[in-house]
């Protein structure tokens, strides 16, 4: 079956940077993939890109730059200050639609240990929700 | 045939609102994000923000947050603008500007622009 | 944001000379998924609101003629207008359409002489 994988990393230079990156393990055909923190996307997540394998990325602050890394896993650099800052305990979550196999989201969050600058290994996380 | 219908141009004192109108026609309203664009005394185009007509979600350029606001009303298929604590420094002209069939930001068809002007 | 900067700022050139305009971004545009540059270039005539002509840097939009030809990959990019005609006289900017906020160029003024 496939799963997501979700890795969160707090930039070293910069306490407020978060770089979340996230992958797809399915044999399927990527058509969207969305990243929301605060939760699940649609459970009461906040909406923080939008990556269209055609049409472009769409992006919502404090979200800064939102890129494929391959056809199978993006990254988003997140920039906050003040009240739209994550801090180190926000939960990020990432939903791929993909064809044939649904939607699949997994969401994770800096591990409690990490010094900035280091994060876990990008390992599956749990699949939350499979559609 | 697409078209966007803007509202005609405005003479506003400083420190008053100012709202405008986008009115679409020629294709179904909330099947495209509708994106608002400035353009200073026929120089350069700055992207305002966009908002999606199905759900009425925003999305500011941070240089605009809180100066634009963003609506829609579906009942009309029109997107409006309101800009508001206005100085000189905000006279230009406005253009909606719908998101493109083949990428969100590839913007292929304009309103014919409002032009604003901010003066005592 | 993409910073994308044009030159020249302005050209002067007869009917049926090739006119080439240049525009660089920031960052790379081109998307790693399909392959394709999200770089767009739109025309405005004097007194008219900006039509696309360009997008993903080289795709034609329907109906615009032959002669307007959109190149480049990653960071550079070129309209040519092969054989300039006298309703060709506008401003042109080209536009990156990666990503959230969209930016656009300062403009290439083209006068015909």
């Known amino acids: 079956t496939p799963e997501v994988w979700v890795q969160v990393r707090m930039e070293a230079t910069e306490l407020s940077s978060f770089t979340i990156r996230c992958g797809f393990l399915g044999s399927g055909s990527i058509s969207l993939v969305t990243v929301s923190w605060g939760g699940p996307n649609g459970a009461g997540g906040t909406t923080l890109a939008v990556l269209h394998p055609e049409r472009g990325i769409r992006q919502w602050a404090p979200a800064r730059q939102a890129r494929w890394e391959t056809q199978s896993s993006i990254s988003l650099i997140l920039e906050g200050s003040g009240a739209s800052s994550p801090c180190a305990n926000t939960t990020f979550c990432c939903k791929f639609a993909s064809f044939p196999e649904g939607s699949w989201e997994a969401c994770g969050s800096l591990p409690p240990s990490s010094d900035p600058g280091l994060s876990a290994p990008p390992t599956p996380a749990p699949i939350l929700r499979a559609d | 045939e697409v078209q966007l219908q803007q509202s005609g141009p405005e003479l506003v004192k400083p420190g008053t609102s100012v709202k405008i109108s986008c009115k679409a026609s020629g294709y179904t309203f909330t099947d495209y994000y509708m994106n608002w664009v400035r353009q200073s005394h026929g120089k350069s185009l700055e992207w305002i923000g966009e908002?999606?007509?199905?759900?009425?979600?925003?999305n500011y350029n941070q240089n605009f947050k809180g100066k634009a606001t963003l609506t829609v009303d579906k009942s009309s298929n029109t997107a409006y603008m309101e800009l508001r604590s206005l100085t000189s420094e905000d006279s230009a002209v406005f253009y909606c500007?719908?998101?493109?069939?083949?990428?969100?930001?590839?913007?292929?068809?304009w309103g014919q622009g409002t032009s604003v002007t901010v003066s005592s | 944001d993409i910073v994308m900067t044009q030159s020249p700022s302005s050209l002067a050139m007869s009917v049926g000379q090739k006119v080439t305009m240049s525009c660089k971004s920031s960052?790379?545009?081109?998307?790693?998924?399909?392959?394709?540059?999200?770089l767009a270039w739109y025309q405005q005539k004097p007194g008219q609101s900006p039509k696309l002509l360009v997008y993903f840097a080289s795709t034609r939009e329907s109906g615009v003629p032959d002669r307007f030809i959109g190149s480049g990959s990653g960071t550079d990019f070129t309209l040519t207008i092969t054989s300039v005609q006298a309703e060709d006289l506008a401003d042109y900017f080209c536009?990156?359409?990666?990503?959230?906020?969209?930016?656009f160029g300062g403009g290439t003024k083209l006068e015909i002489n």
């Open positions: 536009q990156q359409h990666h990503s959230t906020p969209p930016t």
């Open positions: 908002i999606n007509p199905k759900n009425g979600d925003t």
């Open positions: 960052q790379s545009l081109l998307n790693s998924f399909n392959q394709k540059n999200f």
């Open positions: 500007a719908r998101e493109g069939v083949s990428s969100y930001y590839a913007m292929d068809y």
